[in-house]
């Protein structure tokens, strides 16, 4: 091998992917208030509704300090695979009675799979242990009746935005870090 | 311009040991994970090790795990690979690469015989 | 042995488009962690070609593709020119190796 000509700088610096990730977490926590607006003004909802397949919440904003880069990042992708998951299913289980939440829901989706894309770069980049995926989970059950799903939809996206917002004070504590 | 630069490669006996460098510039070298790739003489390539950017996880290929080991200094911006117990099969260019990885250096020849 | 499946050898014409496979397995391309092209020109270093399944790094000519499904990916090569002649690598993490893991290698001769 001949002396190295050196390689034009072909993609971000896992500094700026942070900053571009953060970006992209901060548009998606917006996308999934405003659908849980929508969600709210179409189907309003008494109460708090939970779905025993979501995630638990990661942990509160204040136990972060804590946190290691490599347990952040897994948990999150852990965590929003499975939202990623329950939004497929929610948009396959409830496709008309949730069709005027369309296009923003596939909106969503795409963006979710993005942010997962850009998690995975960046563990890879850092060179951080990327371990292995969670046994399949089985099957989501179609929900009992329309009302339902509306209450499947409001937990998801109650839970998502949570878990986004977790997202991004974790993602701005961690860029601190690097 | 990104720049890696690998070193130390040469010839050494069966059983003997090396230390091979890699000089970063061109990037900010503490934010990037590291690897070692080997490439036998026209054969592909095989991953070797990994090092995390703060140098707090180190992962081996099986055929070296034991003998070789991956360390970094952030503040000299280089990368180091000590190869112990060296067989005749580890004869191949080492190539450092950062990131992904996104960038390679031009590699260096290690050559294992008697 | 290499842990990723590559046919060997791919040919083409000038302007012709040729595609080169990957495939894996649960462990890795199957678990959902991105796949990576790399080129090797003649008597030079790997660079990387396709990121992240489907990304093109900057400089990188849009002629180069890439996708994935399932277990496998590909890449795809359009407008073939005599100067992509050189050996074609993919590379995934394996979740089971604790590390990337690389095809065989493609030759691919452009007639």
């Known amino acids: 091998p001949g002396p190295p000509p050196g390689s034009p700088r072909a993609s971000p610096d896992p500094r700026a992917e942070l900053d571009s990730t953060v970006l992209l977490t901060r548009s998606l926590l917006e996308d999934t208030r405003q659908l849980t607006i929508q969600l709210k003004d179409k189907f309003p909802a008494d109460g708090d509704h939970n779905l025993d397949s979501l995630p638990t919440l990661a942990m509160s904003a204040g136990a972060l300090g804590a946190l290691q880069l490599p347990s952040v990042l897994t948990r999150l992708r852990a965590d929003l695979l499975s939202y990623l998951r329950h939004v497929q299913w929610l948009r396959r289980a409830m496709g008309s009675s949730l069709k005027t939440l369309e296009p923003e829901l596939g909106t969503l989706q795409t963006r979710l799979d993005r942010l997962l894309r850009r998690l995975q770069l960046l563990m890879s980049r850092l060179a951080l242990p990327q371990l292995p995926p969670d046994p399949p989970a089985p099957p989501l059950a179609p929900p009992s009746s329309t009302w339902g799903g509306i209450r499947a939809a409001h937990a998801i996206l109650g839970g998502l935005h949570l878990t986004l917002d977790w997202a991004v004070r974790g993602l701005l504590l961690l860029k601190t870090r690097l | 311009e990104v720049q890696l630069l690998e070193s130390g490669g040469g010839l050494v006996q069966p059983g003997g040991s090396l230390r091979l460098s890699c000089a970063a510039s061109?990037?900010?070298?503490?934010?990037?994970?590291m690897h070692w790739v080997r490439q036998a003489p026209g054969k592909g390539l095989e991953w070797v090790a990994v090092?995390?950017?703060?140098?707090?996880?180190?992962y081996y290929a099986d055929s070296v795990k034991g003998r070789f080991t991956i360390s970094r200094d952030n503040s000299k911006n280089t990368l180091y690979l000590q190869m112990n117990s060296l067989r005749a099969e580890d004869t191949a260019v080492y190539y450092c690469?950062?990131?992904?990885?996104?960038?390679w250096g031009q590699g260096t020849l290690v050559t294992v015989s008697s | 042995q290499s842990v990723l499946t590559q046919p060997p050898s791919a040919s083409g014409t000038p302007g012709q488009r040729v595609t080169i496979s990957c495939s894996g397995s649960s462990s890795n391309i199957g678990s959902d962690y991105d796949v990576h092209w790399y080129q090797q020109l003649p008597g030079t270093a790997p660079k990387l070609l396709i990121y992240s399944n489907n990304e093109r790094p900057s400089g990188v000519p849009d002629r180069f593709s890439g996708s994935k499904s399932g277990t496998s990916a590909s890449l795809a090569i359009s407008g073939l020119r005599s100067e992509d002649e050189a050996d074609y690598y993919c590379?995934?993490?394996?979740?089971?190796?604790?590390?990337?893991?690389f095809g065989g290698g493609t030759k691919l001769t452009v007639l």
């Open positions: 061109g990037f900010t070298f503490s934010s990037y994970g």
């Open positions: 690469a950062a990131g992904v990885p996104d960038y």
């Open positions: 090092i995390s950017y703060d140098g707090s996880y180190k």
């Open positions: 590379a995934a993490w394996d979740f089971s190796l604790y590390g990337p893991v």
